[in-house]
Interface confidence: low
């Protein structure tokens, strides 16, 4: 029998054989961390000769070469050091911005042993555009330097680097770039499991939250799937079992898929799982049309019954056919449910492709993806209804370009990964959905549709009132805690008489809750600076109320996201190691940040939070207020850095009874509270007959209107002290 020669050692590395020295066997080289094999593999041909992929000569000497990370091609509005052609593992590159520009991202990045830079792309931004400066990742070249609504930027990679992410991005109306950040990588680079798990988990958790943002099933319920919402998820698991996948690796593919299924079923979402193995042809082991696809035991059992030998007669990798079988399944389900029905249109679809190589038969898999996108009517509005995760395993023949082409492109998310081996894959699936702490009360979800009620649009909004008249507003920040202003309680009257009115789907009047305890900031004292001629001072104007019972989460009652928490990090789709400072840089990233508060009548009103130099000019106006501050010499005595400032130009001003309400912004269709309404120089409700009418200040008013809101980024120690076991805070 023919066999291939055995003189294939690699200096400094090792190799494995998929099927011994026989024809069809794949020889895979590996090197110690920080080195990569060249070539990566060889195939034993039927002629008894080794063939090296993409090699000109039949047998080149295999060597372990040092991994290097790509150099910046250009860095705008700043400098980087040192300037090298490429960087060795462990090497650092540092970034600094010119005056007037703020550094976003990582000031220092280190080259990691997988050929990838740690940290995030450094960008020097002045906050001038409609969208933030999208930056230029290391090794990339960008064309396009306008960041207005509708502007496009294009990226390409230098020399032999491969682009993953979006080659073209557009600045959208919501101030966010379309697609996902492009990254230029060495063809031999791969991802570490500890990076993939949170990236995959964040994206997946966001999808789960959108499917059905309710509590995680308690283990004691025996994983009973509670089918109680209209949201439904179809999960399609595609497992490569072509010849180049060893039987052992196929077992790990199966095990990883089982882990995934197990986790998915632990969420209270309606889910159907399809399982397809593929080589030259696909084999559907479980279809979403089968009622058993909703039953964890049936799904796991069909996974366990998947046989490596199922595909022994066809050993190619036909990714097109695998994805096409998903398309056919979708088509059948659409016929069954009816194309125009909500039942069909409300299903979210997630495809996870586990492969060890690029497709080598059956045509371009991209064609099947295009068909899938078309049948699901995926457009900007329905982008959340499809997620395709393309995971390459083994650094062999995995084609970055193809994986990138197949994976979804969503801002702040990654859907295409290459892992070093199946062990790494197993680690990823073990850790990716470990978000049990985060899904209980998914935060910052408001109904944005035109026919939603005010309370459905801002379900965190609550009214705080004594037995007599309404006094203050507040925001649910968990299912039992409300954040509000301390000055609402300055008369110190008995809190047992107070009530908190929370939204309730059953009643247009909401539901009343008693207050179990009020935690008022000890630093708040409205008369603290009376002897300095400052008649009222609102520093530390913050309070927390613990409700006597937990609020049942609903369309009308749901917490807002508090920045600097893991819950908000998930909603922002930021990487796991993010800090509080990262959140501040992302949310308050311009000199004028559009934000909102809720009016007495429940409607959402617009303001602009002034930052940097604009904050100074916004606050300076206070010196013109001679009644409250007769002999004020330093504005900062009154407007400390605890306050955000609004009230310029076309801003609405809050009324007296709106104190304590959230000052919030929208990012990625989620809402984040950055401040709370504290005090101002003008009350638009004064003298108006009802709560629907507000009077704008006359242009000639001295001082002009200004409003000051407690900045939650400046109250972190206090918030952490009292909410440490309620929310999961990030490092500062």
């Amino acid at each position: 029998a023919t066999s291939c020669p055995q003189n294939v050692n690699i200096s400094g590395g090792t190799f494995t054989l998929s099927h011994g020295w026989a024809p069809g066997s794949l020889l895979i080289y590996s090197c110690p961390q920080g080195l990569y094999p060249s070539p990566a593999s060889r195939l034993c041909k039927s002629s008894g000769q080794w063939q090296t992929p993409r090699a000109t000569r039949s047998l080149t000497k295999a060597v372990c070469k040092p991994v290097r990370c790509p150099a910046p091609v250009s860095f705008e509005n700043g400098i980087y050091t040192p300037r090298l052609g490429s960087y060795p593992v462990g090497g650092n590159v540092s970034f600094e911005c010119e005056d007037g520009f703020i550094l976003r991202g990582s000031p220092v990045r280190q080259c990691r042993p997988n050929g990838m830079w740690d940290g995030e792309t450094a960008v020097c931004d002045n906050g001038a555009g409609h969208c933030p400066n999208p930056g230029i990742s290391l090794g990339a070249v960008r064309t396009g330097s306008r960041f207005g609504h509708g502007d496009k930027v294009r990226y390409r990679c230098s020399s032999n680097l491969v682009l993953t992410g979006s080659a073209e991005r557009e600045c959208q109306g919501n101030g966010v770039w379309s697609g996902t950040e492009p990254i230029c990588r060495q063809p031999y680079s791969y991802d570490f499991p500890e990076d993939v798990a949170p990236a995959l988990g964040t994206s997946f958790s966001h999808m789960l939250g959108a499917t059905n943002p309710t509590q995680r099933t308690k283990e004691s319920l025996g994983r009973k799937i509670q089918i109680q919402r209209s949201g439904h998820l179809n999960l399609y698991l595609l497992l490569d079992s072509s010849q180049s996948v060893s039987e052992n690796d196929f077992l790990i593919f199966k095990e990883s898929a089982s882990l995934m299924v197990d986790r998915i079923f632990s969420f209270e979402i309606n889910v159907s799982v399809a399982i397809i193995t593929f080589a030259s042809e696909p084999k559907v082991l479980m279809s979403v049309l089968n009622v058993n696809s909703r039953d964890i035991t049936e799904v796991i059992s069909s996974l366990e019954n998947a046989k490596y030998k199922d595909h022994e007669n066809g050993t190619g990798t036909n990714t097109y056919a695998a994805l096409n079988s998903v398309y056919l399944m979708m088509n059948n389900q659409m016929q069954l449910l009816g194309m125009k029905t909500m039942a069909w249109q409300e299903i979210r679809h997630a495809i996870i492709l586990l492969t060890d190589g690029k497709s080598n038969m059956g045509g371009s898999p991209k064609t099947a993806v295009d068909q899938i996108r078309e049948i699901l009517n995926i457009n900007q509005k329905r982008n959340d209804y499809l997620d395709i995760y393309a995971i390459g395993v083994g650094k062999l023949d995995v084609d970055w370009r193809e994986l990138n082409e197949l994976g979804s492109k969503k801002d702040g998310e990654r859907h295409a990964f290459i892992l070093q081996d199946t062990k790494a894959l197993h680690q990823v699936f073990e850790h990716m959905l470990d978000v049990s702490k985060l899904t209980d009360t998914i935060c910052g979800v408001g109904n944005m549709s035109a026919n939603a009620s005010d309370q459905e649009r801002t379900p965190w909004h609550v009214t705080i009132k004594p037995k007599s008249q309404e006094t203050c507003r507040g925001a649910l920040i968990s299912d039992q805690w409300v954040l509000t202003a301390a000055h609402c309680f300055r008369d110190g009257n008995d809190h047992s008489l107070w009530r908190v009115n929370v939204g309730d789907p059953k009643s247009q009047w909401g539901k009343e809750f008693l207050i179990e305890k009020a935690v008022i900031s000890p630093g708040f004292d409205v008369f603290a600076k009376k002897n300095q001629g400052i008649l009222e001072f609102y520093g530390d104007d913050i309070a927390l109320l613990k409700l006597a019972q937990k609020v049942k989460m609903s369309t009308h009652a749901r917490p807002i996201c508090l920045p600097c928490t893991m819950e908000a990090n998930l909603a922002l789709r930021r990487p796991q190691g993010s800090t509080c400072r990262d959140h501040e840089n992302e949310l308050l990233n311009k000199q004028s940040v559009p934000a909102h508060f809720v009016a007495l009548n429940g409607s959402k009103l617009n303001i602009n939070l002034k930052m940097g130099v604009e904050w100074t000019s916004c606050a300076e106006v206070v010196s013109q207020e001679k009644t409250m501050f007769p002999n004020l010499t330093d504005v900062r005595e009154v407007v400390t850095d605890q306050f955000l400032c609004s009230g310029t130009q076309e801003d609405e001003s809050p009324c007296k009874g709106e104190s304590g309400g959230a000052v919030f912004l929208e990012r990625r269709f989620r809402f984040f509270q950055v401040g709370l309404v504290s005090w101002g120089l003008y009350n638009p409700c004064l003298g108006s007959a009802d709560k629907n009418s507000r009077k704008r200040a006359p242009r000639s008013k001295v001082p002009p209107p200004r409003d000051f809101h407690i900045n939650l980024f400046r109250m972190q120690p206090w918030l952490r002290q009292h909410l440490g076991d309620v929310l999961n805070f990030l490092p500062l």
Epitope: P522, R581, P717, R720, Q721, G724, D725, F729, P731, L732
Partner: antibody
């Protein structure tokens, strides 16, 4: 497993400075804060300050504000505490301790570094 | 500045229940942690967030906190529990330790 390994004992003269290192391993360095606490012979624990390994931001106890500097090197997962203008009452064991958030406490401590200030 | 007060010493026989108190102004509104320190060793966290036990700490250690006083309770005290115990809380952004209590098991 989590380990915080501190540098060895130091003997310093009054007016000098000392720099103590604390090498962290076995966990995600940037997810946890690092605190410094000291203990004079036969005395109680005294908090000196905190450093955020991810960004390097610090908060010092009022008492040490002018004399202490805490830094970190994320590439080697090491934090440093430098105390200047040493006096004899600074003779103490200096501990680094890891903590997730204030209310979670300092869940892992280094073995301590004895600093002796003597003329 | 904020202060925490602990009794300097507590003595009891093995098997008895030890209660070590820690008092401070409105301490019940703050979270308290407790540390055990044996001679020549680094401190060990035994209670965090008033009453939670880190993994590896025996169930006989418990904590409570209300009003102006936090209490560490060790039920069925053993000879190995003989050590110094420190309470700790946060005031604004500063950690504050109590003076420590020497627990002697006779």
């Amino acid at each position: 497993q989590v380990q915080l390994v501190q540098s060895g004992a130091e003997v310093k003269k009054p007016g000098a400075s000392v720099k103590v290192s604390c090498k962290a391993s076995g966990y995600s360095f940037t997810t946890y804060y690092m605190y410094w606490v000291r203990q004079a012979p036969g005395q109680g624990l005294e908090w000196m300050g905190i450093i955020t390994p991810s960004g390097g931001s610090t908060t010092y106890a009022q008492k040490f504000q002018d004399r202490v500097t805490m830094t970190r090197d994320a590439s080697t997962t090491t934090v440093y505490m430098e105390l200047s203008s040493l006096r004899s009452e600074d003779t103490a064991v200096y501990y680094c301790a890891r903590g997730y958030e204030g209310s979670y406490g300092f869940d892992h401590w280094g073995q301590g570094t004895l600093v002796t200030v003597s003329s | 500045s904020y202060e925490l007060t602990q009794p300097p010493s507590v003595s009891l026989s093995p098997g008895q229940t030890a209660s070590i108190t820690c008092s401070g102004d409105k301490l019940g509104n703050k979270y308290t942690c407790w540390y055990q320190q044996k001679p020549g060793q680094s401190p060990v966290l035994v209670i965090y967030q008033d009453n939670k036990r880190p993994s590896g700490i025996p169930e006989r250690f418990s904590g409570s906190n209300s009003g102006n006083t936090a209490t560490l309770t060790i039920s069925g005290t053993q000879a190995m529990d003989e050590a110094d115990y420190y309470c700790q809380t946060w005031d604004s952004s500063t950690a504050v330790f109590g003076g420590g209590t020497k627990l002697t098991v006779l």
